[in-house]
């Protein structure tokens, strides 16, 4: 779970060790603040749960790209 200290900076201290199905993901944001101990990605699921993930892992990168592509492609 992400942790907000002195909001609005949100940091991740641990990453999920489970691959999350992209069908469960709604959006993401990157955490790159120097106030945080490590770079991270926070996925928001379709039920509004936030999950910290390691941006170096392939499934995380692939999930971000999939979400970006969905955003760029107009729904017909």
């Amino acid at each position: 779970q992400p942790d907000a200290i002195n909001a609005p900076v949100t940091c991740c201290y641990n990453f999920t060790n489970r691959k999350i199905s992209v069908q469960r993901l709604a959006s993401y944001r990157r955490i790159t603040s120097s106030k945080c101990p490590k770079e991270a990605v926070i996925f928001k699921t379709i039920v509004a749960k936030e999950i910290c993930a390691d941006p170096k892992q392939k499934w995380v990168q692939d999930s971000m790209d999939h979400l970006d592509k969905q955003t760029q492609t107009p729904k017909t």
């Epitope: 199905s21 170096k56 892992q57 392939k58 990168q61 692939d62 999930s63 971000m64 970006d68």
Partner: antibody, heavy 123, light 107 residues
Framework: QVQLKQSGAELVRPGASVKLSCKAS????????INWVKQRPGQGLEWIAR????????YYNENFKGKATLTAEKSSSTAYMQLSSLTSEDSAVYFC????????????????WGQGTSVTVSS | SIVMTQTPKFLLVSAGDRVSITCKAS??????VAWYQQKPGQSPKLLIY???NRYTGVPDRFTGSGYGTDFTFTISTVQAEDLAVYFC?????????FGGGTKLEIK
Amino acid sequence: QVQLKQSGAELVRPGASVKLSCKASGYTFTDYYINWVKQRPGQGLEWIARIYPGTGNTYYNENFKGKATLTAEKSSSTAYMQLSSLTSEDSAVYFCARSGSTVVGNYYGMDYWGQGTSVTVSS
Amino acid sequence: SIVMTQTPKFLLVSAGDRVSITCKASQSVSNDVAWYQQKPGQSPKLLIYYASNRYTGVPDRFTGSGYGTDFTFTISTVQAEDLAVYFCQQDYSSPWTFGGGTKLEIK
């Protein structure tokens, strides 16, 4: 059939830049990543970076940040890698290789490779 | 970066022999390991993905196994055309990294 066709050999001066190309055919260009891999003569393989043409998102090996810049042109299904401030250490064969997405279900490793482009840096 | 330590560096074998190559990752990479074959003057060719899945058209004499940190690639019956360098590669965590390669030579 899937093909990745790379541009021809380059002989470049130290300090110069070079832009290599990788033209894809036989599949939907925006559905797969293009990776770039370096191989020095008689040496192993070193992954440089990858680009997802569907979004333009790039992921770099830290060792090549500032050295390599990846771009992709959807209209021509062509991926590019620019190498800057060249030195003799950059003399190598550079391969492009396709890989799928783990979340879409078309991932099988780097399943198709270009023929390689030889870059020689010499004055 | 994850280091992939591949052994041995060289293998001198006779046609018909069974050979195994091992790759040890410096940390767990799940099953995100591929094996490639590179013949002299050619591009690498994918043989195995997800540690144990044989790629389309790859002969069944090539097999892969392993999970976590320890991986093995086996050729059950070496043939003359298997003369090549073989590489393992992880793509669990960026940067993707390769083993140093194993040069297979036929007696």
